[in-house]
Interface confidence: medium
Amino acid sequence: MGTPRAPWPLVWAVLQLGWWPGWLLDSPYRPWSPLTFSPAQLTVLEGENATFVCHLPDVPESFVLNWYRVSPRNQTDKLAAFQENHTEPGKDRRFRVTRLPSGQDFHTTILAAQLNDSGIYLCGAIYLPPNTQIYESPRAELTVKERVLEPPTESPSPPPRLTGQGQGLVVGVTSVLVGVLLLLLLTWVLAAAFPRATRGACACGSEDEPLKEGPSAAPVFTVDYGELDFQWREKTPEPPAPCAPEQTEYATIVFPSRPGSPGPLPLRPEDGPCPWPL
């Protein structure tokens, strides 16, 4: 026996709802970046530490790693920086950048997170000469929730909370479960609304009958977990030419491009340096 099949537009809607947390942080138009900043969403209770991981795929000898908070008006507040093997805190020492033994991963931690720490965060890296490149990670969202002091009761203690990277998993699983539950709910509603479907007459597919491939088959939905984009970048990526006094050294500025794109673009020699007056 088959199960009632819901109309595809409804399934599509449910799937989109199910993917909401990831979808919120997605923009298919933002270029791919080699830097990653995870988890994409993190929820902690006030007073707890909040940790994101900034991953640099290849770490040059000389680089600067910066950690930022982004305001709704696209202003950045640099929280901390890492250069030449030591971390330099910003004006608030609760913000720490720690290099992990892998050398490619950096823990960016807010110690004793406060409610007003909720917001959008990202890391940026500048690879210094001779191979100058600039990268920016996807954005990630931190939510700091208020601690609700519940009166003591006889009820058993709540299960331990997942913090840090476990939160990403919780959010993902929760969103999928919500999607599944909504799908089941819709199926039940449809079964009630269209009793004919429950009798197996035409509306049901046989268990032996696979879904047909081809143009009439159901659309495939993919979710591209990208980064939050409120038209924050001022420009479309193009490597800049240095405006230099002498034509001695050409830096290569790499701007994130889509996966599979040619990668670092060298500076165009015809751009030339910016002449210094004699």
């Epitope: 910066n66 202003q75 910003g90 600039i134 800049p240 030419a241 405006c243």
Partner: antibody, heavy 124, light 107 residues
């Protein structure tokens, strides 16, 4: 080669308006913001603000809100600074400049390419 | 806005001397500091960005260091052509303020 070329010197009376141009060449104009910097005679540098060359949205430092206006003419890769109701204290050299890096939210705003400056003299 | 206090205002040195200029920010600007050189009648030129990184083509006698609120710019061996005014600038937060400048004169 990358260049920012500014318009020539201006001699104005108080209350008049001046419009300075900054013409970019050697790079894609809309890929970098344009910043404006004031230098009064014998004084230091004062950052006035910048304009997003893609959207045309200006950002002004507090001291330059009101009588000052940044604008663009992207078809000719030019940025403009207009000062209305000129005052004696507007007498200065005004520079346009381009930041070192293509504009990314995390880019340093250090300016590696500067126009030659436009001298504005306001005197009755 | 962030105030950049630059010292000294004037320096009179001989060719071959070592020169140090300091800039103090009124609050932490992490490493978002640049140093510029402005020769008489010319526009400024970028020498150092991100506090310690030399810009393309800048001779290695020019160095920068510092983090947070205290920054130093050094010319290890002054040459006659270094006669100029030197400015620091913070590009940590808008408005991107400059120091008052240091005029370097050669004896």
């Amino acid at each position: 080669q990358i260049q920012l070329v500014q318009s020539g010197p201006e001699l104005k009376k108080p209350g008049e308006t001046v419009k300075i141009s900054c013409k970019a060449s050697g790079y894609t104009f809309t890929d970098y913001s344009i910043h404006w910097v004031k230098q009064a005679p014998g004084k230091g540098l004062k950052w006035m603000g910048w304009i997003n060359t893609e959207t045309g949205e200006p950002t002004y430092a507090d001291d330059f809100k009101g009588r000052f206006a940044f604008s663009l003419e992207t078809s000719v890769s030019a940025a403009f600074l207009q000062i209305n109701n000129l005052k004696n204290e507007d007498t200065a050299t005004y520079f346009c400049a381009r930041p070192l890096f293509y504009y990314y939210i995390t880019s340093p705003r250090s300016m590696d390419c500067w126009g030659q400056g436009t001298s504005v003299s306001v005197s009755s | 806005s962030i105030v950049m206090t630059q010292t000294p205002k004037f320096l009179l040195v001989s060719a071959g001397d070592r020169v140090t200029i300091t800039c103090k920010a009124s609050q932490s600007v992490t490493n978002d500091v640049a140093w510029y050189q402005q020769k008489p009648g010319q526009s400024p030129k970028l020498l150092i960005y991100y506090a310690s990184n030399r810009y393309t083509g800048v001779p290695d006698r020019f160095t920068g260091s510092g983090y947070g609120t205290d920054f130093t710019f050094t010319i290890s061996t002054v040459q006659a052509e270094d006669l100029a005014v030197y400015f620091c600038q913070q590009d940590y937060s808008s408005p991107y303020t400059f120091g008052g400048g240091t005029m370097l004169e050669i004896k």
